[in-house]
């Protein structure tokens, strides 16, 4: 049985390809899924010579490898696109690369929002 999972209802949303895909560029996404299925947030990005290029953020459908992850942490060594998922509202705001081979942990903080 599932125990103590953080319910995910909303995630940070971002789409680098927003113009072509005719979506919003950024904001919040309310997660919708089938009854009895868990929902997650995710982030995906590229790292070109230390420069982080955000690809997408948003809601992610029930995926067992995302269960009970409170933080969004990618562990692949050097993929074309980094991916992480997590549970809990807006848990994909920050995302981290913690390579399995024991390289340095790199956490990406969102830029501060401008005062309104």
């Amino acid at each position: 049985s599932g125990r103590g999972e953080a319910e995910t209802r909303e995630c940070i949303y971002y789409n680098a390809n927003w113009e072509l895909e005719r979506t919003n560029q950024s904001g919040l996404e309310r997660c919708e899924g089938e009854q009895d299925k868990r929902l997650h947030c995710y982030a995906s990005w590229r790292n070109s010579s230390g420069t982080i290029e955000l690809v997408k953020k948003g809601c992610w459908l029930d995926d067992f490898n995302c269960y009970d992850r409170q933080e969004c942490v990618a562990t692949e060594e050097n993929p074309q696109v980094y991916f992480c998922c997590c549970e809990g509202n807006f848990c994909n705001e920050r995302f981290t690369h913690l390579p399995e081979a024991g390289g340095p942990e790199v956490t990406y903080e969102p830029p501060p929002t401008a005062p309104t």
Partner: antibody, heavy 118, light 111 residues
């Protein structure tokens, strides 16, 4: 290189117990959900149980609920399946499998045979 | 009780093309079930072929491809070879920590 090595299988009488282990190496065990899958002699594959990265969420196929318990020790890189009240129909090769994103089994062990017979 | 159905057996000539399917009794298979396919030869552990509907696992030849055909997941083998003779299993992830395997398809390569 990812390796999953099951152990603990053997011959047990109906009603008896066994504890299977799966020793993982070649990847960071704590970062991945894990699962047990079995195959009765001459039959197809059957999913048995799954456990999340922390061990906080565990799931079972209906036929083993209340009899089998899956657990993991992330400090020892080991997955376990405690099997109680064993029945003849639990006779199978038991495989442990690593779960990857998109909920699929990307690596499998070679399996350990459990025989339940009097 | 969810039942995942596959053709029990299938035959193909060497060099031919075969499509194995995977459906279930509760509706249509979609990408949200993350269909995956596994090959197994007698006495061996399963080998992962296709995951997330249509992504080939590393080292799998491009003769193997996955798709959704109508309301089923499908595995297509083009240019079948003798060593493709195996059992093939599909798996659907039903969500909430539950997977269901199909009964498997025994593929025979004729000749």
């Amino acid at each position: 290189e990812v390796q999953l090595l099951e152990s603990g299988g053997g011959l047990v009488q109906p009603g008896g117990s066994l504890r299977l282990s799966c020793a993982a190496s070649g990847f960071t065990f704590r970062n991945y959900a894990m699962s047990w899958v079995r195959q009765a002699p001459g039959k197809g594959l059957e999913w048995v149980s799954g456990i999340s990265v922390t061990g906080g969420s565990t799931y079972y196929t209906d036929s083993v609920k209340g009899r089998f318990t899956v657990s993991r020790d992330n400090s020892r890189n080991t997955l376990y399946l405690q099997m109680n009240s064993l029945r003849a129909e639990d006779t199978a090769v038991y495989y442990c499998a690593k779960v990857y994103y998109s909920s699929f089994f990307d690596y499998w062990g070679q399996g350990t045979l459990v025989t339940v017979s009097s | 009780q969810t039942v995942v159905t596959q053709e029990p057996s299938f035959s193909v000539s060497p060099g031919g093309t075969v499509t194995l399917t995977c459906g279930f009794n509760s509706g249509s298979v979609s990408t949200s079930y993350y269909p995956s396919w596994y090959q197994q030869t007698p006495g061996q552990a399963p080998r992962t072929l296709i995951y997330n509907t249509n992504t080939r696992s590393s080292g799998v030849p491009d003769r193997f491809s996955g798709s959704i055909l109508g309301n089923k997941a499908a595995l297509t083998i083009t240019g079948a070879q003798a060593d493709d003779e195996s059992d093939y299993y599909c798996v659907l992830y039903m969500g909430s920590g539950i997977w269901v395997f199909g009964g498997g398809t025994k593929l025979t390569v004729l000749g």
